[in-house]
Interface confidence: low
């Protein structure tokens, strides 16, 4: 459709408060180190700006694209060049090469304060004092933090932001009812986020022929029943959609998330029997409940698929006429017969197939090439399979913490230059798979689990990417998106690493790890455990076990002391010394 | 291998119209996102238009909007740029490209992404 001005059109479909909550998100991706009241400021003129449009849509500059006058508006930051140095060059280029440059300028690790939750009743004060500037704020520092979150869904969280501050500050106890509450949203947001961010670079690294290829097949899984011309037309609009938010045009994807919600409402039918209570809810309820629904029961009459993928003679005919077409069809037909597979299993089936079809029409017998390529699956399913049960077992007799222990033992010996930041982000989210996934029975497992990897190995790539210190890190990230987690579980310790000198300081604690949460006092722990394997990248498991098991007495013994900071001076210096001599360095 | 030539480019009076042609050989560019860049001297190469390969989607940068079109034929296997009312800025050689596995419609900017490219033609418009 074509609209004499895009910013009337986007400001009517979705109404000003949206209107307004969008464009901050967009400021805040772009802009992360700019002031709250700089955005509002911005915020509040772009929408002064779009009512002028609303009334007149042959008003000056109203005819401007989306890029052109966002773009303009950013580059009015009077601050831009001190606060954020080379991305000021981007506003010296013209459209589109401007938001490309950008885009290109997105931080996924800003230097920013970390978020510290005020007390309660100081929250609610605030929340009741101003809730609007209250919510903005809200969306202002998430946005700001992850500059790929998912827009249409960051108005989701906000909106049971507020629901609970407005439940929770009238309750006789107040930090009972909250807290909880801002826990769930705060650990649902991160994991929101880091699975948008995998959606982005799945385009942006890969291409959107990448991007549909997933998306073909978690859909085939999710609605079994829905016809291939079916599954096609919602992969292209979801398509659509997350192009839009991975590439900033944030008015554009809520308004087109929402036309598909609504679309696929009306057409429930033909889609998915279990869509009827997701329908019945509000926009951005309808939405995420639509995005989370449970896989349909799949149809009872499925023939088999070697039909028409090995056994008929026009295999190669089907496959020449339309590559493309031939093998959605194959990853439909495949996925939704396998709920039980990861989507990415699902991928590298297709890519098998593909690549057999490839070499097997060109051959003097094609069939007798290609009749035998269901076989060449069985290894590529086994080995997630084993991985999976393997993994699983080790963590319930581990434990989370002692899990993700050995994980981060494991993938700081495969690659020891990344970060000690990033490797126990990393290994930490990794561990987290344990809790998540082995809980599940056998036909659930590898889907809830190695989707689950995909996602925490990109957060992986997309910090290394920035500051890119290891050939196998970006080896694994960069050669093929579905094979990355089988790349990272086939590195063997790094023979080449020199071992980092050591230095005593790495491993001084004082009397405020005492006063930590159990979670921030595990992650001391495993930082002084990746720092030691990177002193001594040969220490044994038990060498390991036995260094950070005297840490842990360490500490408990001088949180109870009555001088603890004189504790932690002297017990500290023996440790070191005791651990020296136990790991011979 | 998709070997491209481009052709129609000349000398032409401001206000005026050019129509380049860019022709395919080696295999079909149904199959491929075409672009069309253009390069002044002493200048970067810089987008000026585009076409997808799936749905006929078209991009053009902000200066070109609304008198550059950018066509395809599949049939004839061969990709157009209509350019009216011309002006001296747009004086440059104009190169076409292809590109096998669209990222992003709009990232059609990005000339890294192409994989083929011909060798130019020139078009110089005089005031």
């Known amino acids: 459709d074509a609209h004499k001005s895009e910013v009337a059109h986007r400001f009517k479909d979705l109404g000003e408060e949206n209107f307004k909550a969008l464009v901050l998100i967009a400021f805040a991706q772009y802009l992360q180190q700019c002031p709250f009241e700089d955005h509002v400021k911005l915020v509040n003129e772009v929408t002064e700006f779009a009512k002028t449009c609303v009334a007149d849509e042959s008003a000056e500059n109203c005819d401007k694209s989306l890029h052109t006058l966002f773009g303009d508006k950013l580059c009015t930051v009077a601050t831009l060049r001190e606060t954020y140095g080379e991305m000021a060059d981007c506003c010296a280029k013209q459209e589109p090469e401007r938001n490309e440059c950008f885009l290109q300028h997105k931080d996924d690790n800003p230097n920013l304060p970390r978020l510290v939750r005020p007390e309660v009743d100081v929250m609610c004060t605030a929340f009741h004092d101003n809730e609007e500037t209250f919510l903005k704020k809200y969306l202002y520092e998430i946005a700001r933090r992850h500059p790929y979150f998912y827009a249409p869904e960051l108005l989701f969280f906000a909106k049971r932001y507020k629901a609970a501050f407005t439940e929770c500050c009238q309750a006789a106890d107040k930090a009972a009812c909250l807290l909880p509450k801002l826990d769930e949203l705060r650990d649902e947001g991160k994991a929101s986020s880091a699975k948008q961010r995998l959606k982005c670079a799945s385009l942006q690294k890969f291409g959107e022929r990448a991007f549909k290829a997933w998306a073909v097949a978690r859909l085939s899984q999710r609605f079994p029943k829905a016809e291939f011309a079916e599954v096609s037309k919602l992969v292209t609009d979801l398509t659509k959609v997350h192009t839009e938010c991975c590439h900033g045009d944030l008015l554009e994807c809520a308004d087109d998330r929402a036309d598909l919600a609504k679309y696929i409402c009306e057409n429930q039918d033909s889609i998915s029997s279990k869509l009827k209570e997701c329908c019945e809810k509000p926009l951005l309820e309808k939405s995420h409940c639509i995005a989370e629904v449970e896989n349909d029961e799949m149809p009872a009459d499925l023939p088999s698929l070697a039909a028409d993928f090995v056994e008929s003679k026009d295999v190669c005919k089907n496959y020449a006429e339309a590559k493309d077409v031939f093998l959605g069809m194959f990853l439909y037909e495949y996925a939704r017969r396998h709920p039980d597979y990861s989507v990415v299993l699902l991928l590298r089936l297709a890519k098998t197939y593909e690549t057999t079809l490839e070499k097997c029409c060109a051959a003097a017998d094609p069939h007798e090439c290609y009749a035998k390529v269901f076989d060449e699956f069985k290894p590529l399913v086994e080995e997630p399979q084993n991985l999976i049960k393997q993994n699983c077992e080790l963590f319930e007799q581990l434990g989370e913490y002692k899990f993700q222990n050995a994980l981060l033992v494991r993938y700081t010996k495969k690659v020891p230059q990344v970060s000690t930041p990033t490797l126990v982000e990393v290994s930490r989210n990794l561990g987290k798979v344990g809790s998540k996934c082995c809980k599940h029975p056998e036909a659930k497992r590898m889907p809830c689990a190695e989707d689950y990897l995909s996602v925490v190995l990109n957060q992986l790539c997309v910090l290394h990417e920035k500051t890119p210190v290891s050939d196998r890190v970006t080896k694994c990230c960069t050669e093929s998106l579905v094979n990355r987690r089988p790349c990272f579980s086939a590195l063997e310790v790094d023979e080449t690493y020199v071992p980092k000198e050591f230095n005593a300081e790495t491993f001084t604690f004082h009397a405020d790890i005492c006063t930590l949460s159990e979670k921030e006092r595990q992650i001391k722990k495993q930082t002084a455990l990746v720092e030691l394997v990177k002193h001594k990248p040969k220490a044994t498991k038990e060498q390991l076990k036995a260094v950070m098991d005297d840490f842990a007495a360490f500490v408990e013994k001088c949180c109870k002391a009555d001088d603890k900071e004189t504790c932690f001076a002297e017990e500290g210096k023996k440790l070191v010394a005791a651990s020296q001599a136990a790991l011979g360095l | 291998q998709v070997q491209l030539v481009e052709s129609g480019g000349g000398l032409v009076q401001a206000g005026g119209s050019l129509r380049l042609s860019c022709a395919a050989s080696?295999?079909?560019?149904?199959?491929?996102?075409m672009g069309w860049f253009r390069k002044a001297p002493g200048k970067e190469r810089e987008f000026v238009a585009a076409?997808?390969?799936?749905?006929?989607?078209?991009y053009y940068r902000d200066s070109v909007k609304g008198r550059f079109t950018i066509s395809r034929d599949n049939a004839k296997n061969t990709v157009y740029l209509q350019m009216n009312s011309l002006k001296s800025e747009d004086t440059a050689v104009y190169f076409c490209?292809?590109?096998?596995?669209?990222?992003?419609?709009?990232?059609?900017?990005?000339?890294?992404?192409?994989?083929?490219w011909g060798q130019g033609t020139q078009v110089t418009v005089s005031s």
């Open positions: 076409i997808t390969r799936h749905d006929y989607n078209t």
């Open positions: 080696g295999r079909t560019l149904s199959s491929y996102d």
């Open positions: 490209a292809a590109r096998l596995d669209p990222i992003f419609a709009s990232n059609s900017a990005y000339s890294n992404l192409y994989d083929y």
